[in-house]
């Protein structure tokens, strides 16, 4: 969490951002909030990116002002116009690219004063893993698949019964480049598994950590998966 204060003759206002991550090819949110103003027409929002000459986005007098927007962001940005009045300056970024990573500044002017805060934005690819029973294998085998990751993640298997066990000798992980030549499909196979035991396939890079769990019993297969973005620090 980054909290910034204005520095000028006017009063300063508090601006708060949260470091976040964008999933390549999908839409992302750069989060920024500020002390709200009564009049929308008195609020100016500017998003800037370190190393980029033009603006990322500007919103003033109740509407977008994109005359100085940098080419790399053309047609890809929007604020939540109906939420600006309540202090939400978050930016929606469409079709996130690897090159969108960097340091952004959320700069706010209201009738109360000015303020800004920086935001670290990481980009990559992450997806939920799915763990299934591999019926094509000769022994009891599990297969963990996740369609899109970048940078290349680590994959670790764990089990509830054999806590702390190292499964690297009985697992095999491969990374297959997807058609856009950036992200990769992750496939990991775990051999010689047993029933009535929960196995977890954990995939992690510097952006996200995802886990897929499976438990096979005589009567059912239970699955669960979750994904967590790393380094979501507020400023």
């Amino acid at each position: 969490l980054i909290i910034g204060f204005g520095i000028s003759g006017r009063h300063s206002i508090t601006v708060t951002t949260v470091a976040s991550a964008g999933n390549i090819g999908e839409d992302g949110i750069l989060s920024c909030t500020f002390e709200p103003d009564i009049k929308l027409s008195d609020i100016v929002i500017q998003w800037l990116k370190e190393g980029v000459l033009g603006l990322v986005h500007e919103f003033k007098e109740g509407k977008d002002e994109l005359s100085e927007q940098d080419e790399m962001f053309r047609g890809r940005t929007a604020v939540f116009a109906d939420q600006v009045i309540v202090g939400n300056a978050s930016l929606r970024l469409k079709n996130v690219q690897l090159t969108d990573a960097g340091t952004y500044k959320c700069y706010i002017i209201t009738s109360k004063g000015k303020g800004n805060a920086n935001l670290e934005y990481k980009t990559g690819a992450f997806s939920m893993p799915e763990v299934n029973v591999d019926y094509n294998a000769s022994s009891e085998t599990l297969r963990c698949e996740a369609p899109r990751w970048f940078p290349q993640p680590t994959v670790v298997w764990a089990s509830q019964v054999d806590q702390g066990a190292n499964f690297s000798e009985v697992s095999n992980t491969s990374f297959e480049l997807n058609s856009e030549n950036v992200t990769m499909k992750v496939v990991s196979v775990l051999y010689n598994v047993t029933i009535n035991n929960t196995y977890s396939c954990m995939i992690e890079n510097d952006i996200a950590k995802a886990t897929g769990d499976i438990k096979v019993t005589e009567s059912e297969i239970k699955r669960r998966s979750h994904l967590q973005l790393l380094n979501s620090k507020a400023s």
Epitope: V133, Y135, E140, I195, V216, T217, E218, S219, E220, I221
Partner: nanobody
């Protein structure tokens, strides 16, 4: 309560054919893989064949490949084992059982019927 009732066994000459049936009740049949297992009198149980819930996947123990065919009728909650080219070594009590997956370690199976005896002899 899970119930599995096998039928169709009998005495058959070498090279002959039989069709075994297993009527299942007490559980949602379409949620389970069904398996056939056999036991030669005085010996341990041996897995024979399996079929997936939608019949899209089947597999067999090596010694019965090309001679036995497993099938199922989900409308009737019944699994079948069609046996051709029977040999003396196929003589056994045949059981059907269920499991949540296609895995087929004998110790994983919990529900058994009374079995049906197949005797191959001239």
């Amino acid at each position: 309560e899970v119930q599995l009732v096998e039928s169709g066994g009998g005495l058959v000459q070498p090279g002959g054919s039989l069709r075994l049936s297993c009527a299942a009740s007490g559980f949602t049949f379409t949620d389970f893989w069904m398996h056939w297992v056999r036991q030669v009198p005085g010996k341990g149980r041996e897995w024979v064949s399996r079929i997936s819930p939608d019949s899209s996947s089947t597999s067999y123990e090596d010694s019965v490949k090309g001679r036995f065919t497993i099938s199922r009728d989900n409308a009737k909650n019944t699994v079948y084992l069609q046996m051709h080219g029977l040999r003396a070594e196929d003589t056994a009590v045949y059981y059907c059982t269920r499991f949540s997956t296609g895995w087929h370690r004998i110790e994983y199976f919990q529900h058994w019927g009374q079995g049906t005896l197949v005797t191959v002899s001239s």
